[in-house]
Interface confidence: medium
């Protein structure tokens, strides 16, 4: 599923991401935009043999199990394919674990490079939340 901007903002808010670990909803929507272009089925392969999955591009080396990433830790204890569902529950729950891990949203390269320090509230402007 490819979410609309406000549709995703509403879904993320429903799942409790607004101000989760101090990150406003705009940060999460911005991260999703530049990680996956709001596409729940996005997959991207990395040079280390791992793959990033879903709307928040969660990595198979650390967070989920895709059955083919050597040394996968599967810290979210889920199959990576669960992160590709049109229901973003699994991605949100895993993202909460990731953002609590110590580096905050710096874990997402796209957030670090495209969202951090910008007017992230623009990503939810005009949305009825």
């Amino acid at each position: 599923k490819v979410f609309g901007r406000c549709e995703l903002a509403a879904a993320m808010k429903r799942h409790g991401l607004d101000n989760y670990r101090g990150y406003s909803l705009g940060n999460w929507v911005c991260a999703a935009k530049f990680e996956s272009n709001f596409n729940t089925q996005a997959t991207n392969r990395n040079t280390d043999g791992s793959t990033d999955y879903g709307i928040l591009q969660i990595n198979s080396r650390w967070w989920c199990n895709d059955g083919r990433t050597p040394g996968s830790r599967n810290l979210c204890n889920i199959p990576c394919s669960a992160l590709l569902s049109s229901d973003i529950t699994a991605s949100v729950n895993c993202a909460k674990k990731i953002v609590s891990d110590g580096n905050g949203m710096n874990a997402w390269v796209a957030w670090r490079n495209r969202c951090k320090g910008t007017d992230v509230q623009a990503w939810i402007r005009g949305c009825r939340l």
Partner: antibody, heavy 116, light 107 residues
Framework: QVQLQESGAEVMKPGASVKISCKAT????????IEWVKQRPGHGLEWIGE????????YYNEKFKGKATFTADTSSNTAYMQLSSLTSEDSAVYYC?????????WGQGTTLTVSS | DIELTQSPATLSVTPGDSVSLSCRAS??????LHWYQQKSHESPRLLIK???QSSSGIPSRFSGSGSGTDFTLSINSVETEDFGMYFC?????????FGGGTKLEIK
Amino acid sequence: QVQLQESGAEVMKPGASVKISCKATGYTFSTYWIEWVKQRPGHGLEWIGEILPGSGSTYYNEKFKGKATFTADTSSNTAYMQLSSLTSEDSAVYYCARGDGNYCYWGQGTTLTVSS
Amino acid sequence: DIELTQSPATLSVTPGDSVSLSCRASQSISNNLHWYQQKSHESPRLLIKYVSQSSSGIPSRFSGSGSGTDFTLSINSVETEDFGMYFCQQSNSWPRTFGGGTKLEIK
């Protein structure tokens, strides 16, 4: 136990298309990548590409882009590979395998012969 | 693409001999190297994964070693059922690639 069952041998004319199937049993089909591999005598094994059935995500070896197209039907636990604009170079045995990085589980292979 | 070069192309041995098959990668692939056996008109069978981990049901006479770019499959005391083709494969990067194979034949 995990099994991959491929469709039977095909004899096709040059220029035609063919669709090979790979039915999976014994595991959760949607969560594992299915890989496709080509084997021609004297050419060893070549990786064609892969599909994740649960999402339809696909990746192709550059060499096979435009030649192979992958699809999957999660209701029947079956992956498909269509090969188009067939030439004699496409005559080979085609395998599906479960993509665990290494390939522990293989189909029995589908022999494709392209001949006028 | 990562090239895998296997040597020798053919190995003629007598049952009971011990042999080593080589696989060399064009660049480092860490430990992401796997070995397969293939007999005539059969699908490949995984023998060794990640350089040295035996696949389920594989006899203990098969072992693997190496790291980086140089890898070896060893067969301790070859049995008649071991004759056939052996391929290495890397899963370090895409596209996945295979070696050209080593044919193990009876002398």
